[in-house]
């Protein structure tokens, strides 16, 4: 009886999660005389196997980051080894799991920002990559400022775009940053995958040194005032 796991030779597509040890067959192809055996070719990577009787299976865990789709061909042969049916395309789509952590491209970033810069205008980007599928939460990154050093009166002078990693001044930062009082800051920034929404997310951390420079226009006005 034909069912979900057996049937005649025809083009088929199967989806299998990466990282899982083989637990069941993929498919049992049924031979129609004069076909007596089956043959598998294509991107098998020595993982996919077909037995002579048509049993298609895989022998070890798949890795989407190595190959996201395996394009295979199955043919039916007669007793003389001549192809009598096929080959037909068999497509194995490897589904993503969260098996890679995001990684910042740099362990330390350096940037400068002029005092009174417009709030929300990026002056520096931090960037992380994740080998997992960006179309799934596994590869969707969430950036966050863990801490700002120094923290003056519990006021955050810097903010980060959670999706892009763009760092800019907050409204308070635009108004209050003063290189004469404190010319340098440090941010500890984390990135999490799973969009930052899961306890099972992976993370990485980087350090950002920021120099605050004087507002030239303000200095210019000040200069003219005294002359």
């Amino acid at each position: 009886q034909e069912g979900k796991f057996s049937g005649p030779l025809k083009p088929m597509t199967f989806s299998i999660y990466e990282g899982q040890e083989p637990s069941q067959i993929i498919f049992q192809f049924k031979a129609n005389p004069p076909a007596v055996t089956f043959e598998l070719t294509g991107e098998t990577d020595n993982i996919f196997v077909i037995e002579r009787e048509g049993l298609l299976y895989y022998n070890r865990a798949l890795d989407r980051e190595t190959r996201s789709t395996h394009n295979l061909q199955v043919a039916a042969l007669d007793a003389n080894g001549i192809i009598v049916e096929g080959p037909v395309p068999i497509t194995i789509k490897v589904k993503d799991i969260n098996d890679n952590r995001p990684t910042f491209l740099q362990s330390k970033y350096e940037g400068s920002v002029r005092q009174n810069s417009r709030p929300g205008k990026p002056f520096l980007y931090v960037n992380a990559t994740d080998l997992d599928d960006p179309a799934t939460p596994n590869g969707q990154l969430y950036y966050q400022i863990v801490i700002q050093l120094p923290m003056i009166n519990n006021v955050m002078y810097f903010q980060i775009n959670n999706k892009t990693g763009a760092i800019s001044l907050t409204r308070e930062g635009s108004q209050e940053l003063n290189p004469a009082k404190n010319p340098s800051y440090n941010l500890v920034i984390s990135v999490k995958d799973m969009g930052g929404q899961s306890e099972n997310s992976f993370s990485d951390t980087t350090s950002v040194d920021i120099i605050v420079t004087e507002n030239i226009w303000k200095a210019h006005k000040h200069h003219h005032h005294h002359h």
């Epitope: 362990s107 801490i147 050093l149 923290m151 519990n154 340098s184 984390s190 990485d204 350090s207």
Partner: antibody
Framework: EVQLQQSGPELVKPGASIKISCKAS????????LNWVKQSHGKNLEWIGL????????SYNQKFKGKATLTVDKSSSTAYMELLSLTSEDSAVYYC???????????????WGQGTSVTVSS | DIVMTQSPATLSVTPGDRVSLSCRAS??????LHWYQQKSHESPRLLIK???QSMSGIPSRFSGSGSGSDFILSINSVEPEDVGMYYC?????????FGGGTKLEIK
Amino acid sequence: EVQLQQSGPELVKPGASIKISCKASGYSFTGYALNWVKQSHGKNLEWIGLINPYNGGTSYNQKFKGKATLTVDKSSSTAYMELLSLTSEDSAVYYCARWDGNPHYYYAMDYWGQGTSVTVSS
Amino acid sequence: DIVMTQSPATLSVTPGDRVSLSCRASQSISDYLHWYQQKSHESPRLLIKSGSQSMSGIPSRFSGSGSGSDFILSINSVEPEDVGMYYCQNGHSFPLTFGGGTKLEIK
């Protein structure tokens, strides 16, 4: 005077989980990050992670992902570290330590708690 | 991760000696290097931060030097109460890492 007072020693069975506390006093709790450090065999020091009491932001050493969870209670100026699914490898002294708040002194730990000894044994 | 390597593992000295403890980082960490002292049954104590900045209350015989990947903690006249473990810490990038320590003992 800055003080970090940690909870007492723990003797637990393998597979159990515990929560260690670190009560801060003598400074503005939300103004400084708190770190947790593991010391095994009275020697090696390993940084577990940090938490910012101001916003609850955390950074973990990936080696301790799934092993340690850091939280704070601002109302009591207390930081907590939960250690999960303990094994004999987790037997150690655990310290909380405050970061120097000055960006010029990158991530120096200027005040330390007295340590909490955790022994995992059946 | 940045690996911090300390040497020697043990240093046996006579009171009054000048000693140097070495710490090497696996990559350049500028001057983002901190030194801690840990006496028996005590918590670590910050001695030197950012390579050479002494903490207040630390005796002047302790000094730090170095930049990049090689650092030295010097004690210019060792006293008996200086016995204990000395650790260096990478303050440059995450995860923060410590050296394996140097044990200072009196002969």
